[in-house]
């Protein structure tokens, strides 16, 4: 048999909390235990379902868990059931609700005098109490002309006169919790003694030295007062009028007109209307001279033909707010098409090169008009006028690239040799219409250029091949004067260049021809044995036949080349004593002789008490000091060679003799005494 | 050679306006494009906008339209830039410069602009 | 207008080192296959010098020590190594579009 150990029972529960209707059953057999509500089988979910035998509730919700509740044991083998004892949920909850109008049926139908009855749609279980409020204050039962009835349900307000006026809301509580009205009722009732708002004024805008009208006019039983006032208080009557407002006109409608507004009228007039009872009312609005500031400039712009394209026009800052339009060539744009005005904005659609020109941004209002163009280019591809040419440049001469395009707008042109960018300096300039000049063409500018010339439409590019002529001219210049070592063999050498392989030959410059022993050997003057006759003038002469011929004048003089015949020698001195060292050279010019000494030149105008240069060339240096060591330098030169040898000088001190050392023993190194 | 002279230092007062002058050797302004470039003291540097001499045709930065004029003289080789209604922002050096294509290469020496009460 | 932004304002760098200057643009100064920002360099009393053209081509008797390099928005001036009469304004322009702008400027001194 089924046995069921726990029962569901019936208990209270909270709206939304938590709840268990308990079950546990035992039995001989397996069974399967389910539940049921109101006789059906409840559907698992997560806010209710089987906890074991147990059903479990997340949250209870008072509409969907009204009703029986029954626990159900089956032994699916034998086919027996028990149920168990019926249970139930005393739900406690409260829902908020609007405040409504229960009568009379409308609220136009509300006059004073009448009764007045507001229904507070608060529900729960158990019922809750009301508490009503008038514009946050809470109301008792009687109190002034009201009454709560139907258990504080409804509030009745009779008879309902101007006093009941006000925001009515509700609050209701029970043992479950609170709520309040969810929507609150505003009762509006008259009393005609009130002053009342038939027309009131709005804000004008006007322009300087126009009129302006404010209306403005109460009803009241009997008829209110109207009264204006200015920003500071003045009153305005058609009696007395502030000096600002001489020309202020108060009509008996109570309208007030201004004539010839100037920038002092601007500001907030206030509209006081008093009822026999009740407080004043006070309208404001407020007179705006009216005003258009200037319009910001405009760019240029560049757009490409097939594009589409907008330009904003931004209105200016004014009072009241511009009104904006674009027009073209004096005309209006209209509001569709493919150039047309949308908003503030010019569109172009597909724009085609005819579109360019001036299009005009006007903006208005009362204060005035203001405009701004801005002129659009329509960019298009550059065309040719000129492609560079490969071209002839003669060797130093200046030499011209062309590359002149044409399009919209400007192109801008740029060079590249050998696919490097060609930057504006002393040898290139790229003038504005895309020309390049080379200022000195020289053998290397021999190469490829090329030339972009580009618009935002695009770009075209052409190259050219420039070649260098060449100019007749010896490579290198032979040196003017030149000098041959007497009863030596000796070379002058002469080579040229130039567009085609020029002819090189020598000659004596006063015609007389080379002697036998000297040979022109391809541009190179040989001279088997140099005799004192060979010295003299010779040219040079390069020639082709397509650039003439060139010369070059040399001057060979011939000499016995510098020999040394005293050299100086490594030499040690006793520091106070006197260093002699001896230099003697021989050579045809007759060498000079030249003195360094420690890295500089001795000049024998400002050699100093202690040293002097002989005629013969040595060096003598008195009293020697310590500081004179070092390399000296004997150079000997003449117009047509030089030459120079070096040698030591060590200064030390004098050492002091030993006992052991006779008179006559010599000193340890080689010496200089004086 | 290339040069770019400019005319000589200026103390204007507020208000008052300047020419200033660049005048072009070694070169025919007519074959470029001549700058303005402003350069207050010890500040960088603003393109005030370009001249092309040959037809006159002008391009300005937009915070110059309207204050700086920029003409060229092809006869005498010479462009000129004028200030009008100087303010103390206009202290400043004004350089004029040349290019062919699109980089300033050749640059005058500049002129001193100083306005003071 | 295309702002360009120079960083940093100011470098000291050691004799034999390498200074590095960026200029950022608001956007790409690329066209026609070209980037056209330049760098110049001012000392004082003096008007700026081209130094670098195109963003990596080296202006007329520029030392090969100055290089630049980038393209779209992105551009560095490199010097190495630095000598002592390096020290001057480097400015970044942009030829793009007009109105051309300059960066603010970068004051490179010795370290």
């Known amino acids: 048999a089924i046995v069921f150990i726990k029962q569901p029972s019936s208990q209270d529960a909270l709206q939304g909390r938590r709840a268990l209707l308990r079950c546990e059953v035992e039995a001989p057999g397996p069974v399967h235990v389910y539940w049921l509500l109101d006789g059906a089988p409840v559907q698992d979910t997560e806010r209710r379902f089987a906890q074991g035998s147990s059903l479990s509730f997340a949250a209870v919700d008072r509409l969907q868990d009204s009703g029986t509740f029954q626990c159900v044991a089956r032994d699916d083998v034998t086919g027996e059931e028990a149920r168990s004892a019926n249970a139930s949920f005393n739900i406690k909850w409260i829902e908020a609700g609007p405040v409504v109008l229960k009568h009379p049926a409308s609220e136009a139908e509300i006059q004073p005098q009448t009764q007045v009855t507001l229904r507070c749609h608060i529900d729960g279980h158990p019922r809750p109490t009301y508490q009503w409020f008038r514009d946050g204050t809470p109301l008792s039962d009687g109190q002034s002309n009201h009454t709560v009835s139907s258990k504080e349900r409804n509030l009745t307000l009779r008879p309902a006169g101007p006093e009941h006026s006000g925001l009515y809301s509700c609050c209701a509580h029970s043992a479950f919790g609170q709520a309040c009205s969810s929507q609150n009722f505003t009762l509006s009732i008259a009393d005609e003694s009130f002053a009342r708002v038939v027309l009131a004024p709005q804000d004008v805008v006007v322009a300087r030295y126009e009129e302006a009208m404010f209306h403005c006019q109460f009803s009241a039983q009997p008829p209110p007062s109207l009264q204006w006032l200015f920003e500071d208080e003045t009153p305005i009557t058609n009696r007395s009028r502030p000096p600002h407002l001489r020309r202020a006109t108060v009509f008996a409608n109570g309208s007030l007109l201004l004539t010839q507004v100037r920038p002092r009228n601007a500001g907030i007039y206030r509209c006081i209307g008093q009822g026999q009872r009740g407080p004043p009312i006070i309208l404001e609005a407020t007179l705006h001279l009216a005003e258009i500031e200037d319009m910001p400039l405009f760019e240029p712009r560049v757009f490409t033909a097939g594009s589409e394209e907008r330009v904003t026009c931004l209105p200016p800052k004014g009072l009241p707010e511009p009104s904006v339009w674009w027009e073209h060539a004096g005309v209006r744009l209209p509001t569709h098409g493919r150039v047309y005005q949308k908003g503030h904005e010019l569109v172009l659609a597909n724009i085609a090169e005819s579109d360019a020109g001036v299009y005009t941004c006007h903006a208005a209002n009362l204060a005035g008009q203001r405009r701004q163009d801005v002129n659009i280019t329509v960019a298009t591809v550059p065309s040719w006028l000129k492609k560079p040419q490969d071209s002839q440049l003669e060797e130093g001469k200046p030499g011209y690239l062309d590359c002149l395009t044409q399009a919209t707008p400007k192109p801008t042109v740029v060079w590249y040799r050998n696919q490097m960018l060609i930057s504006e300096d002393s040898r290139f300039e790229v003038f504005k219409n895309g020309t390049l000049r080379i200022n000195s063409v020289e053998v290397y500018d021999g190469t490829w250029y090329r030339c972009m010339s580009s618009t935002p439409a695009g770009s075209i590019e052409a190259q050219a091949r420039v070649q260098v002529l060449e100019k007749l001219k010896f490579t290198p210049p032979p040196q003017p004067q030149q000098c041959m070592e007497f009863d030596k063999e000796a070379t002058v050498p002469c080579s040229a260049t130039g567009r085609e392989k020029p002819t090189i030959k020598w000659e004596r410059a006063d015609g007389s021809s080379l002697p036998e022993w000297v040979t022109d050997n391809a541009g190179t003057l040989h001279f088997a044995r140099v005799t004192r006759d060979d010295a003299g003038n010779y040219t040079c002469i390069a020639s082709n036949g397509p650039q003439g011929q060139i010369r070059a004048h040399v001057q060979l003089t011939v000499a016995v080349f510098i020999t040394f015949k005293v050299e100086p020698e490594r030499t040690t001195v006793y520091q106070g004593h006197t260093a002699l060292l001896q230099c003697e050279a021989q050579g045809d010019p007759k060498p000079l002789i030249q003195w360094k000494g420690k890295d500089r030149i001795l000049d024998p105008t400002k050699l100093g008490p202690r040293m002097h240069i002989f005629q013969n060339g040595s060096l003598v240096i008195h009293d020697v000091a310590p500081e004179d060591s070092g390399r000296y330098t004997c150079i000997a030169g003449n117009s047509c060679n030089i030459k120079h040898t070096e040698a030591p000088l060590y200064v030390v001190d004098k050492p002091v003799p030993e006992e052991s050392e006779g008179p006559g023993s010599p000193p340890p190194y080689k010496m200089i005494q004086t | 050679q290339v040069q770019l002279q400019q005319s000589g230092a200026e103390l204007m007062r507020p208000g008052a306006s300047v020419r200033l002058s660049c005048t072009a050797s070694g070169f025919d302004i007519k074959d470029y494009y001549l700058h303005w470039v402003k350069q207050r003291p010890d500040q960088g540097l603003e393109w005030i906008g370009r001249i092309d001499p040959e037809d006159g045709d002008t391009e300005y930065a937009p915070n110059f339209q309207g204050a700086a004029t920029m003409t060229a003289d092809t006869s005498s080789n010479t462009a000129y830039l004028h200030l009008n209604s100087l303010t103390s922002g206009d202290t400043a050096v004004y350089y004029c410069?040349?290019?062919?294509?699109?980089?300033?290469?050749?640059w005058g020496q500049g002129t001193l602009v100083t306005v003071s009460a | 207008d295309i702002v360009l932004t120079q960083s940093p304002a100011s470098l000291a760098v050691s004799l034999g080192q390498r200074a590095t200057i960026s200029c950022r643009a608001s956007?790409?100064?690329?066209?026609?296959?070209?980037?056209?920002m330049n760098w110049f360099q001012q000392k004082p009393g003096q008007p700026p010098k081209l130094l670098i053209y195109a963003a990596s081509n080296q202006g007329s008797g520029v030392p090969a020590r100055f290089s630049g390099s980038g393209s779209g928005t992105d551009f560095s001036l490199n010097i190495h190594p630095m000598e002592e009469d390096d020290t001057a304004m480097y400015f970044c322009q942009q030829s793009k579009e007009v109105p051309w702008t300059f960066g603010g400027g970068t004051k490179l001194e010795i370290k």
């Open positions: 956007e790409s100064v690329d066209n026609y296959g070209i980037s056209f």
């Open positions: 410069s040349r290019t062919g294509t699109r980089w300033i290469a050749y």
